[in-house]
């Protein structure tokens, strides 16, 4: 999906209003310095591409974040403010349902969510030059 036509200001407002708080809740008990940010993004469409990938694609050591509250809200925000996004996700959702696993918060998942927090922060500051 090409995130170029999303309403970035609305997605930012959704993040600041509620998604950010859910990410903090998920990470509660973890020191902010515990993980290094290794994933970066260069502009808002790129940030949303990375956020979608890290939130919804299973990775080694972290089978699925998709059922977490922050993930459900992220999916909803993209569906609302990215035209045509929902339609592209129908097949992906059906595939995900087939391989759904029980929710387990592993250290790898915590690291992944820490990366997500960094991507969201970058998304909210699009005019900053890349380090």
């Amino acid at each position: 999906y090409d995130f170029t036509n999303c309403d970035f200001e609305k997605i930012k407002a959704a993040y600041l209003s509620t998604i950010s708080k859910d990410l903090i809740t998920y990470m509660s008990g973890t020191k902010s310095t515990e993980f290094n940010n290794t994933v970066s993004c260069s502009n808002r469409p790129h940030c949303l591409t990375e956020i979608q990938s890290l939130t919804f694609n299973p990775t080694a050591g972290c089978a699925s974040l998709a059922k977490e509250m922050f993930a459900m809200k992220t999916k909803a925000a993209l569906a609302i403010w990215c035209p045509g996004y929902s339609e592209t996700q129908i097949n992906a959702t059906q595939a995900m349902k087939k391989r759904r696993k029980r929710k387990v918060t592993t250290n790898k998942c915590l690291e992944q969510v820490s990366q997500l927090q960094g991507l969201w922060r970058r998304f909210n500051r699009p005019l900053l030059k890349q380090q």
Epitope: K10, A14, S17, K75, A76, A77, I80
Partner: nanobody, 132 residues
Amino acid sequence: EVQLLESGGGLVQPGGSLRLSCAASGFTFGDYAITWFRQAPGKEREGVAYISNFDGMTYYADSVKGRFTISSDNSKNTVYLQMNSLRAEDTAVYYCAAEGRMGTHSRDSVYFWAFSALYDYWGQGTLVTVSS
């Protein structure tokens, strides 16, 4: 030019009723979500009730569930808030606000409808005072 115009506020005794109206113009009413917000003195603006003019889906704040009813008349481009069993704590300025994408995505909007930062258009507000 987009306009939202609230009316129907006033002074009412505890236990009484009022019906607020929000008349809209200047946008495609049937695609939009309209939400009633309220703001009491010294408090943050809070979402009270949401309606999608696209499919009629409604959401309510817990504090008003069972007492307030939101409805829409698409032929008149007007949304109503029927407020029954009013309490002193319902005293506030009531605003209606409109958002263009949450109307056609009402199920996904369950997470976001009550956040004022997401709305494009606002009325000027109408004061509701509940007092004996």
